[in-house]
């Protein structure tokens, strides 16, 4: 299953399959997730080691048993790959690292006014993988405001150095934020020239294209079909690059198929997995396990559940079958692709779905109508769980926020439905940033069921929580995916990085905002919060957040939206915007429904008709 915990001051011994430099443990974990054989990783921050060569070292590891011995190492961080973690699987990494220079091949330098502008340039450059920016206070005047666009053979820095007044980060192309745009066309009977960066075997051009999309240096590809004249080259997928970023030439060639990486697509990227099953095809590889199962779909499920399994073949040969069950061969290779592909067999083959974003239906559950004051504009995909709850009567208007917690579930505040309990009048918009982008053609979800907490009473601050079941499940994308829920009764975690988002008023007597706003707000203890509210009881089912001096808060229209906190690189839904005295008033924290206190209720209500929980808590 999905293991998200990180181990501090611990290093996994042995099992090394690859090593690289990464700026933090989260990026190291992402590289492990996308590496075909990596199950575990260990990361050495700069502070943890004197050896300059090993600083920022990210060590990817495999283990037949799924675990390795841990040794104590001060400062080291270790953890698991996020294979099998559904919506948490993403190659998108937005963080900017201050005081760090990520080294690589510098292929472009320009003057820009901010690190964000530098990141944007990298994202809009086809070859840029990461960048460094020298700030206005950099010690050498001639380098100030320089934006260096970089690449490397592996897509990660060739070295990382601590350097004052330098900021570094990665391209946001994996976040589907590139302005370049992409070529979706597949060109039959056409071969591209230029430099081959890798060679793998794939059953079709579509798998070849997805592999190209997630390969750090692949910009385009050529696939040789299973009827290609040279037998040894059949099913070969050649991943390619060029100086210009496009093929310098193409040659008409029977039984070849060519195309482009989809990494530069805007708003949608292919899933980093291959779900199609190939009848009459055998995939060869190292044998991991053989099991008897009923049907090819069960074989694929078995492979997906066995974390080291990369692909499978389900044999229908009479000698491989007993009654209704046949042999399911679970296999792996060094690069995650079959070492041999045979056609015209009595087998069916396919790939593990361990890297699919959708996973199963589960989710990592790792008084005044309130209200964002003092916030700033959010960017695309920054808060992909945020939804807008809108009411369509004569006109249509945004009323509340909400959080996507599953394919078919939204969590919000009960008070959003005060006086409006009819599900037909509501429209739920997900995957949006600007309310003004909503037109009559913008897709929206309708409500199948509104589940208001049984103890909620209108105009009271208690039990202000409601679930919305959508009529149809939503697909996950970089811009529309769920937020993890906390563990039941989560009281021990100290959250220090918390944000509230919404389209609500920007001042107490204001109006709904067009661009989704975000504000970083510290949590306040319930004891402190209680002292600020002379007349209302702050219960253990509430959490408070706010600045002593005021000025930053949620406001009218933010109700029902998320209070999220980042802990160990993972965002958790800690609160639901509920109520407060006015907005952003001095010494009046916002009050939020504490999600951890309602986990039993959420899990009970989201049980599907077959009794299978639709969401689960992280271990």
């Amino acid at each position: 299953g999905c293991l998200t915990q990180l181990y501090e001051n611990a290093f996994f011994r042995g099992g090394d399959v690859a090593s690289m430099y990464t700026p933090n443990a989260q990026y190291c974990q992402m590289r492990c997730t996308f590496h075909p054989r990596c199950l575990l990783f260990s990361f050495l921050p700069a502070s943890s080691i004197n050896d300059m060569e090993k600083r920022f070292g990210c060590f990817l590891k495999d283990s037949v048993t799924g675990t390795l011995p841990k040794v104590h190492r001060t400062g080291a961080v270790s953890g698991h790959s996020l294979k099998q973690c559904g919506h948490q699987i993403s190659a998108c990494h937005r963080d900017i690292y201050k005081g760090v220079d990520m080294r690589g091949v510098n292929f472009n330098v320009s003057k820009v006014s901010s690190v964000e502008e530098c990141q944007k340039r990298c994202t809009s450059n086809i070859r840029c993988q990461f960048f460094s920016y020298a700030t206005q206070t950099f010690h050498k005047a001639e380098y100030r405001n320089n934006c260096l666009l970089k690449y490397s053979p592996g897509g990660t820095p060739t070295a990382i150095k601590v350097l004052s007044n330098v900021e570094s980060g990665f391209s946001l192309k994996p976040c589907a934020l590139s302005e370049i745009g992409c070529h979706m066309n597949i060109f039959q009977h056409l071969a591209f020239s230029d430099v081959d960066v890798a060679r793998v075997l794939t059953p079709d051009a579509f798998v070849c294209r997805t592999i190209c999309t997630y390969h750090p240096n692949c910009l385009f590809f050529t696939f040789y079909t299973n009827v290609w004249k040279i037998e040894s080259q059949r099913n070969v997928c050649l991943l390619k690059t060029s100086e210009s970023g496009t093929p310098s030439s193409s040659t008409p060639q029977e039984n070849t198929i060519s195309g482009y990486s989809l990494l530069t697509c805007k708003r949608t990227l292919p899933e980093p997995c291959h779900s199609k099953i190939y009848p009459g095809v055998d995939f060869g590889g190292e044998e991991l396990n053989v099991t008897f199962v009923k049907g090819v779909n069960v074989c694929q499920e078995t492979c997906t559940k066995m974390i080291r399994c990369q692909f499978f073949t389900y044999s229908l040969l009479p000698e491989d079958c007993k009654e209704e069950k046949c042999k399911c061969f679970l296999r792996l290779s060094m690069d995650g692709s079959p070492t041999r592909i045979a056609y015209g067999t009595q087998g069916s083959s396919g790939y593990s779905l361990r890297l699919c974003n959708t996973g199963d239906n589960s989710v990592c559950t790792t008084k005044t109508s309130t209200r964002i004051v003092g916030g700033t504009n959010s960017s695309w995909g920054e808060w992909p769980w945020q939804v807008s709850l809108q009411v369509k009567l004569t006109a249509q208007r945004h009323l509340c926020g909400g959080s996507l917690i599953g394919h078919q579930w939204v969590l919000t505040a009960a008070h959003c439905f005060d006086g409006l309990p009819l599900q037909d009048v509501w429209r739920i918009y997900s995957g949006i940033l600007n309310l003004s982008d909503i037109t009559k053609d913008t897709p929206f979800s309708q409500i199948k069921e509104i589940i208001i907490h049984q103890n909620y009473k209108v105009s009271e601050g208690n039990h202000d929580i409601a679930l919305i079941k959508l009529q149809a499940p939503l697909n996950y994308t970089e811009f529309q995916k769920p937020i993890c829920l906390p563990s039941k009764g989560d009281t021990s975690t100290i959250y220090t990085n918390c944000w509230v988002t919404g389209w609500g008023f920007s001042k107490e007597k204001g109006e709904i905002q067009n661009i989704l706003q975000k504000v970083n707000i510290p949590l306040v203890t319930n004891e402190e919060c209680q002292k600020r509210y002379q007349d209302y009881k702050i219960t253990q089912r509430m959490v408070c957040a706010g600045y002593k001096e005021g000025g930053k808060d949620a406001c009218k229209g933010d109700s029902g939206g998320p209070l999220v906190c980042k802990h160990n690189g993972m965002w958790r839904l800690v609160g639901i915007t509920s109520w407060g005295e006015g907005c952003a008033r001095r010494e009046q924290p916002g009050v939020y429904t504490k999600v951890a206190e309602y986990m039993d209720w959420i899990l009970e209500k989201t049980q599907s008709s077959d009794g299978k929980a639709q969401m689960q808590s992280p271990a």
Epitope: N462, K531, R532, Y533, Q534, Y536
Partner: antibody, heavy 116, light 106 residues
Framework: EVQLQQSGAELVKPGASVRLSCTAS????????IFWVKQRPKQGLEWIGR????????KYDPKIQGKATLTADTSSNTAYLQLSSLTSEDSAIYYC?????????WGQGTLVSVSA | DIQMTQSPSSLSASVGDRVTITCEAS??????IAWYQQKPGKAPKLLIY???TLQSGVPSRFSGSGSGTDFTFTISSLQPEDIATYYC????????FGQGTKVEIK
């Protein structure tokens, strides 16, 4: 309308116990805290304690620990103050009050007279 | 234990006068001070909380100020209906009242 109705005056003998009641209307006591405050004749106010009727959690002034016991019955929306081993020092008006961080709304008070 | 020393214990002023009452805490109470008004034979009424925040419905002639350990309650223009005893209350650590100030009209 929020109201706290307190029980009538009590005349009790030294050493005895007494139970005072405070019945709420216009709100549910589970949604608030109930505080008790003592005021001796011609004297100031003294906080006795606080109860959270939802879970019966209580807090007392350390100086009077053992003298007072706070309870609540959510079904009747009533809070109680039990005073034991009464002496003349306990002769006072006892107020119940509701609130969050402090006492926002008060009952009319109950006079307790301890006399042989 | 936090002690609250309130002064004066009583004062006499004319209608329209500015009246000031002070409260000193034995420790820093982080501005968690409230002021109550009690009229004869009645229960106390909350006027101000968190040093200076006026409870809704309370006339604006009542105000509070201060920080740390020293706090002041002011009636900017005394009215006949303001005849009462006024108490400060600290609620930073449990609850402690001041001894009270009786306000009379000359």
């Amino acid at each position: 309308e929020v109201q706290l109705q307190q029980s009538g005056a009590e005349l009790v003998k030294p050493g005895a116990s007494v139970r005072l009641s405070c019945t709420a209307s216009g709100f549910n006591i589970k949604d608030t805290y109930i505080f008790w405050v003592k005021q001796r004749p011609k004297q100031g106010l003294e906080w006795i304690g606080r109860i959270d009727p939802e879970n019966d959690n209580t807090k007392y002034d350390p100086k009077i620990q053992g003298k007072a016991t706070l309870t609540a019955d959510t079904s009747s929306n009533t809070a109680y103050l039990q005073l034991s081993s009464l002496t003349s020092e306990d002769s006072a008006i006892y107020y119940c009050a509701k609130g969050g961080g402090l006492f926002a709304y008060w009952g009319q008070g109950t006079l307790v007279s301890v006399s042989a | 234990d936090i002690q609250m020393t309130q002064s004066p214990s009583s004062l006499s002023a004319s209608v329209g006068d500015r009246v000031t009452i002070t409260c000193e805490a034995s420790h820093d109470i982080n501005n968690y001070i409230a002021w109550y008004q009690q009229k004869p034979g009645k229960a106390p009424k909350l006027l101000i909380y968190y040093t200076s925040t006026l409870q809704s419905g309370v006339p604006s002639r009542f105000s509070g100020s201060g920080s740390g350990t020293d706090f002041t309650f002011t009636i900017s223009s005394l009215q006949p209906e303001d005849i009462a005893t006024y108490y400060c209350l600290q609620y930073d650590n449990l609850f402690t009242f001041g001894q009270g100030t009786k306000v009379e009209i000359k």
